[in-house]
Amino acid sequence: PEPPTACREKQYLINSQCCSLCQPGQKLVSDCTEFTETECLPCGESEFLDTWNRETHCHQHKYCDPNLGLRVQQKGTSETDTICTCEEGWHCTSEACESCVLHRSCSPGFGVKQIATGVSDTICEPCPVGFFSNVSSAFEKCHPWTSCETKDLVVQQAGTNKTDVVCGPQDRLRA
């Protein structure tokens, strides 16, 4: 028969012969022969390969460096890489999560629209009319101004995006 020029899925062509690729979690140690299948070996303790492959070396698992604020979110296996995330109060600087930065705080006049996660920073929004924030915080939303009317009080000092209204007693009618 004619030697093959292309091979099936999960095979590779070598020396006019189709050999099986190694399954995820294993590396190539010797091509198939006319008598035997491909020889593959499991990846070592801290290594992985996540595809059908003919790699001769497994990849090292990612190291979640605590000095960079990283911790392990999901331990790697022979078929998957380790997934890192950031310590509490920090978030990844990139999709690959190679280092972390402190979550930003929303300044006075801004409230938290979305609390930060291990992979995304805090999202702030300006406090709209009727709301305020007087602190720098990574958690606090804009608070509504106090409603003086519901307390049978009147506004003595108007609120801003950074301050609440000041309520006071209503002026008494003079006799």
């Epitope: 070598i14 020396n15 190539l28 140690v29 010797s30 091509d31 022969t33 008598f35 035997t36 299948e37 020889e39 070996l41 499991p42 003919r54 001769t56 070396h57």
Partner: antibody, heavy 110, light 111 residues
């Protein structure tokens, strides 16, 4: 596979055996050296991996060195003794020795 | 170092009979299945029969059968033929630091 370099040597004379390969690539195949003393069983000496790192039987460490080029695999016997008299085979594979050469005879005698 | 013990030796069988050769490893073989069987006739290199404990090498007659896992393995030759007279070796692969090892061999005599 074809082994060469086997001959009569005196004890202590270094000797290098060569296995010449054709029809496959050493960059994606491991190779083993195995020997067989006259009338005795098979004895694994060592292998060389795809990456070029060698592994040896515990008794063979320090006495034998395996190395390779793109088409040959060498076995160096640093200081042969009469106990090293044997037919030496090279075989293709890592844990499974699928294809063997015919062997080359080494005789160590004074 | 690992030791592979083959039993019995020698073994004889009539034509058409069955031969069973055992191979015991002093430690688990790699992935529990990295064990091969070879046939050797005088003046020839060994020939691979079985690999990964039970896979038949291409071109080898189906009367040869391998079984076992971990430390205990068996080669069975059913319907023995005159041509099967030879010495049979088991060979195991171990984790990378320990490499490979051969059993002592079993001579099969066909009567």
């Amino acid at each position: 596979l074809e082994e060469s370099g086997g001959r009569l040597v005196t004890p202590g004379t270094p000797l290098t055996l060569t296995c010449t390969v054709s029809g496959f690539d050493l960059s994606s195949n491991a190779m083993n050296w195995v020997r067989q003393a006259p009338g005795k069983g098979l004895e694994w000496i060592g292998y060389i991996t795809i990456s070029g790192s060698a592994g040896y039987a515990s008794w063979a460490k320090g006495r034998f060195t395996i190395s390779k080029t793109s088409t040959t695999v060498d076995l160096k016997i640093s200081s042969p003794t009469t106990e090293d008299t044997a037919t030496y085979f090279c075989a293709r594979g890592y844990n499974t020795m699928a294809i063997w050469g015919p062997g080359t005879l080494v005789t160590v005698s004074s | 170092a690992q030791v592979l013990t083959q039993t019995p030796s020698p073994v004889s069988a009539p034509v058409g009979g069955t031969v069973t050769i055992n191979c015991q490893s002093s430690q688990n073989v790699l992935i529990n299945n990295r064990l091969a069987w070879y046939q050797q006739k005088p003046g020839q290199p060994p020939k691979l029969l079985i690999y990964d404990a039970s896979k038949l090498a291409s071109g080898v007659p189906s009367r040869f059968k391998g079984s076992g896992s971990g430390t205990q393995f068996t080669l069975t030759i059913s319907g023995v033929q005159c041509d099967d007279a030879a010495t049979y070796y088991c060979q195991a692969g171990y984790s990378s630091g320990d490499g490979n090892a051969f059993g002592g061999g079993t001579e099969v005599v066909v009567k």
